[in-house]
């Protein structure tokens, strides 16, 4: 079951101490099960298994990727898993830790010297290969900081969004990936109904910006399911 999966999400952020104020960010700590931490004059414990459900790699941390935790795991459940280090097996770039990318099923270093040819080659390989991802489509996608000393501007080739400049994300464009603008209020967005539908997108859109979510445009509620237009709207 999911509960018995390798614990990649050990004590991410702790809840407030007993009697503490609501809404205060917890402190990130890594420790064994049954963590004791101070709360006023008392001590409180928390189970260290805190799965973080996700649909896309962008929802996870930069040192994580989004996937089903077990091969036959709970259908539809994906959580953030710890990235794979160099020489570990992978199925897509996002599985490899920053500074690495997936080549021929193994995480390898993103060496500046052989960056462009090999990266684009692996993007092309994975784009046309159903087995290149855990669920049939690629997700977290931007270049490591080793490759770019400056953050990628709009139109720059990328592998991970963290390597695009602020306000940009890394999204598929034909068979490569480039930095594109994060969507603004009123812009058309993509709401993925089917798991794996990202794989069908040749021109992938970014996600909606801060304070916005991708929802059905008010005047399109009556339209058929297939033609409903989604736009970025204020919460």
């Amino acid at each position: 079951t999911l509960n018995s999966v390798l614990n990649s999400n050990a004590i991410k952020n702790l809840p407030p101490p007993l009697g503490g104020a609501a809404g205060h960010p917890g402190s990130a700590v890594s420790a064994a099960p049954g963590i004791l931490y101070p709360g006023g004059n008392k001590y409180q414990t928390i189970d260290n298994y805190q799965p973080y459900p996700c649909a896309e790699d962008e929802e996870c941390g930069t040192d994580e990727y989004c996937a089903s935790p077990t091969r036959g795991g709970d259908a539809g459940v994906q959580i953030c898993l710890a990235c794979r280090k160099r020489r570990k097996r992978c199925m897509r770039h996002a599985m490899c830790c920053p500074g690495n990318y997936c080549k021929n099923g193994i995480c390898v270093s993103s060496d500046q010297n052989h960056f462009r040819g090999e990266i684009e080659e692996t993007i092309t390989e994975s784009f046309g290969n159903d087995h290149s991802t855990l669920d049939g489509y690629s997700r977290r996608t931007t270049l490591s900081s080793k490759m770019y000393h400056t953050k990628g501007q709009e139109g720059s080739v990328c592998l991970r969004s963290s390597d695009c400049a602020s306000g940009l994300c890394c999204a598929r464009h034909f068979w490569s990936k480039i930095c594109k603008p994060v969507l603004k209020e009123g812009q058309v967005c993509t709401k993925h109904r089917r798991k794996g539908s990202h794989g069908l997108e040749i021109f992938q859109r970014c996600y909606c910006g801060e304070g916005l979510s991708c929802r059905i445009q008010k005047d399109h509620h009556q339209a058929s399911n297939s033609s409903r237009l989604h736009t970025c709207q204020r919460h």
Partner: nanobody, 125 residues
Framework: EVQLVESGGGLVQAGGSLRLSCVVS????????MGWFRQAPGKLREIVAA????????YYTDSVKGRFTISRDDAKKTVYLQMNSLKSEDTAVYYC??????????????????WGQGTQVTVSS
């Protein structure tokens, strides 16, 4: 200041139902994953259910599968926990937790960084 306020807890007979709500207010951040945790006396605080930013990926701990349902309403910045067929072992303080991030912010490891104060759920047999 960010606040998470839970409501809907109370005393219920075994086999009964409750619906917990948690409203997030304050702060100018995007809410990513949202979850419900619980802590029974003398036990560790454990995750009950969590839902991804888009709502397309939902996690439940084994003991509540088929009985509890988590959902979210982004327009209201609210997360819900519908609890059916309650058992005495569900008695605990239930806390909601969310991952709130500023625009473009992405931590090394995703986690729940804002927590509510909890609401007591007591199931009598």
């Amino acid at each position: 200041e960010v606040q998470l306020v839970e409501s809907g807890g109370g005393l219920v007979q075994a086999g009964g139902s409750l619906r917990l709500s948690c409203v997030v207010s304050g702060g100018t951040f995007s809410v990513y994953a949202m979850g419900w945790f619980r802590q029974a006396p003398g036990k560790l605080r454990e995750i009950v259910a969590a839902i991804s930013r888009t709502g397309s990926s939902i996690y439940y701990t084994d003991s509540v599968k088929g009985r509890f349902t988590i959902s979210r309403d982004d327009a209201k910045k609210t997360v819900y926990l519908q609890m059916n067929s309650l058992k005495s072992e569900d008695t605990a303080v239930y806390y909601c937790a969310v991952d709130g991030r500023a625009n473009g912010e992405r931590p090394a490891v995703a986690g729940y960084n804002y927590w509510g104060q909890g609401t007591q759920v007591t199931v009598s047999s």
